[in-house]
Interface confidence: low
């Protein structure tokens, strides 16, 4: 990563974590930390789609994108998107959805990220190639099996011994100005909604946890993971792997995706296993839709609002939750490994689906649009633009509806894979997000 | 090659029920979102609603929510559209689009070259 | 409200450039778009998604004459050297909080 997207990723992380909804009271200021940045480029250099099982007492996210370079503001926005399937009161994640990313985010207690991106010609675990792997370590780790990521209240209320308020987040009293932090580049700061439950950036959709224990940290699996129980992840359609150690996506070949689309990938986090380990059912492997999107001008713009999940690059987040294995095996289209790890398409929704806006303004339009004759023939569409793919977990018991979302990767927390892989999520420049 | 072939359309009356499908090939069909957009004659596009990768999720337009149900069998690689209490304003060629995302944004690419759907008594 | 505004017609010489504009409701200037081409008698077709920056990601297929680009909460669709073929409907759309969102369309027309 380059010296601004390493202090873009730091302060967009800060602004997120400054805006949550509803405010914390004891969210840290966070910063970077070039140990757990050169752990994480040591472990994007092996080019494997899945969490690091060494990774030891560090959370982690992970975000892939192909064909167009890495992009600090969207692989942020990937993992946020998920904070509309999240939460807070409850600690939960909606069913078959990804939270682990977004709550490994604004998780209170980490105060130090490092990250490191290395483009893969080949991923280990998917079928794209030329991606660029970005993983972000966390320390202390987020996703603690019980806990919520902050505790709800008056910005700054609860801030630790030896920390002062700053712009909402507590920092550390007399550490000097971090360098690394940006000056909030996001022209449009995200305005989000008052509750996370329902909160989802305004283009997108995000995740939440279970009551009390984020859902995707559910140790038992109940019920089958039906078709129609898993969730699909948005444009945004992730997965996320569950394992009780970070699986690998490259257990078994992953599934192979048959549309080419070039295409994003993010990983979600894992939840940390401070406590018991959690288990998950066994995972099949989705196959990987590829999207073959051209993107022109792309200019690397750090002010992209974190509010706009409808990035050109679509990107997919998961929810962290498992799925029981009927539905994983429904959604996956290719066998999944052995592995505690479930791969559901799943696609948040990006808002209750109940509220509907006009979708047309036809005022003062009058001219007169002619249909198109409808052939008996198989009509044919060529795939086009980019699309994103995303890989998206569940726990176990997750079935539930699931919403539209961005797969944004990978998330794990130290020493266990969470989520296992919902589903492949494709997307505008595809994003390819899962949960490991 | 990404194919979406709708069938289902025809007339019907109003307040009578219809069902559209979308058969889909080249691609994965279940990690996709699925969409069905309308275009009244003469009109534009009007989005009616979505259904995720797994079919877990589903958003519809006010326009026809509580009467129209999207559903999807991943098994067949195809989405179905269930209209009932049909009006004459549903009129209208139906587009069956495949997201570009699972996250079903509701970028829609490809489309359907459609089937038209007439209310009429 | 999400709100996507296009004007009805336009119209451009063959050959010349012609700029379409979807202008985003108040509050929404941060939206990306999509931009889909209906020629006559035809299916919608994708052309690309053009974010808030500028930045876009045409679909396969789509000519170089087609770019995007963006100015607050305005979303242009610029074709270049406006080719006969290019005579068609052009809607923008985006995707607002669990609803899809079509602007009314342009139509148009190569002189």
């Known amino acids: 990563l380059t010296d601004e997207e390493k202090r873009l990723m730091v302060e967009l992380h800060n602004l997120y974590r400054a805006q949550v909804s509803p405010t914390a009271s004891d969210m840290l200021h966070m910063r970077w930390d070039e140990e757990l940045a050169a752990f994480a480029k040591a472990y994007a250099r092996q080019c494997v789609w899945g969490h690091n099982k060494e990774r030891g007492r560090r959370g982690e996210n992970l975000f892939a994108i192909t064909d167009e370079g890495m992009d600090v503001p969207l692989a942020m926005e990937e993992w946020h998107h998920e904070r509309e399937h999240y939460n807070l009161s409850a600690a939960t994640c909606s069913p078959g959805q990804m939270c682990g990313h977004y709550t490994q985010v604004v998780w209170a207690k980490t105060e130090r990220i490092g990250c490191g991106s290395h483009f893969c010609e080949k991923l280990q675990g998917v079928e794209e190639t030329n991606i660029e792997l970005l993983v972000c370590n966390y320390e202390p780790p987020g996703n603690v099996k019980g806990k919520r990521p902050y505790q709800e209240g008056t910005p700054c209320s609860q801030c630790p011994s030896g920390y002062h308020c700053k712009n909402s987040l507590c920092e550390p009293i007399g550490s000097p100005e971090d360098a690394q932090d940006l000056p909030y580049l996001v022209t449009e700061a995200p305005s989000f909604r008052a509750t996370e439950a329902s909160d989802s950036r305004k283009m997108g959709t995000p995740s939440s946890l279970a009551t009390g224990i984020p859902a995707f940290l559910v140790t038992e699996v109940s019920g089958s993971l039906a078709t129609k129980a898993l969730p699909a992840v948005e444009t945004q359609a992730p997965t996320s792997l569950a394992t009780k150690d970070p699986p690998s996506m490259a257990t078994e070949a992953p599934p192979c995706v048959t549309t080419e689309v070039p295409s994003i990938l993010a990983a979600h986090s894992l939840p940390s296993l401070d406590e018991e380990p959690v288990t998950f059912p066994k995972s099949t492997h989705v196959p990987i839709p590829k999207s073959a999107d051209k993107v022109t001008d792309k200019t690397k713009v750090p002010s992209r609002s974190p509010e706009n999940s409808l990035d050109p690059k679509m990107s997919l987040t998961g929810a962290r939750e498992l799925l029981p294995h009927a539905q994983e095996e429904a959604e996956a289209e290719a066998e999944l490994p052995p592995s505690s790890e479930v791969l559901a398409s799943v696609f948040p929704a990006q808002d209750k689906p109940g509220e509907l806006q006009a979708t047309l303004d036809h005022t003062g339009h009058t001219s007169s649009k002619s249909l198109p004759n409808f052939p008996n023939t198989s009509a044919t569409a060529n795939a086009t633009g980019g699309r994103a793919l995303a890989l998206q977990s569940s726990l176990p018991g997750a079935e539930g509806p699931d919403k539209p979302s961005v797969v944004s990767g990978l998330n794990s927390g130290p020493g266990h894979v969470w989520g296992p892989l919902l589903g492949l999520l494709l997307l505008p420049p595809l994003v390819l997000a899962g949960i490991f | 090659e990404v194919q979406l072939l709708e069938s289902g359309g025809g007339l019907v009356q109003p307040g009578g029920s219809l069902r559209v499908s979308c058969a889909a090939s080249g691609f994965t069909f279940s990690s996709y979102a699925m969409s069905w957009v309308r275009q009244a004659p003469g009109k534009g596009l009007e989005w009616v609603s979505t259904i995720s990768g797994s079919g877990g999720t589903t958003h519809y337009a006010d326009s026809v929510k509580g009467r129209f149900t999207i559903s999807r069998d991943n098994s067949k690689n195809t989405v179905y559209m269930q209209m009932s209490s049909l009006r004459a304003e549903d009129t209208a060629a139906y587009y069956c689009?495949?997201?570009?995302?699972?996250?079903?944004?509701?970028?829609?690419?490809?489309w359907g070259q459609g089937t038209l759907v007439t209310v009429s008594s | 409200q999400l709100v996507l505004t296009q004007s009805p017609s336009a119209s451009a010489s063959l050959g010349a450039s012609v700029k379409l504009t979807c202008t985003l409701s108040?509050?929404?200037?941060?939206?990306?778009i999509a931009w889909h081409q209906q020629q006559p008698e035809k299916g919608p077709r994708y052309l690309m998604k053009?974010?808030?920056?500028?930045?876009?990601s045409k679909g396969d297929g789509i000519p170089d004459r087609f770019s995007g680009s963006s100015s607050g909460a305005e979303r242009y669709l610029t074709i270049s050297s406006l080719q006969s073929e290019d005579e068609a409907d052009y809607y923008c759309q985006t995707w607002g909080t669990g609803i899809a969102v079509f602007g009314g369309g342009t139509q148009l027309t190569p002189l």
């Open positions: 689009a495949k997201d570009l995302g699972l996250r079903a944004q509701g970028w829609f690419d490809p």
């Open positions: 053009l974010n808030s920056d500028g930045s876009h």
């Open positions: 108040s509050g929404h200037s941060s939206y990306a």
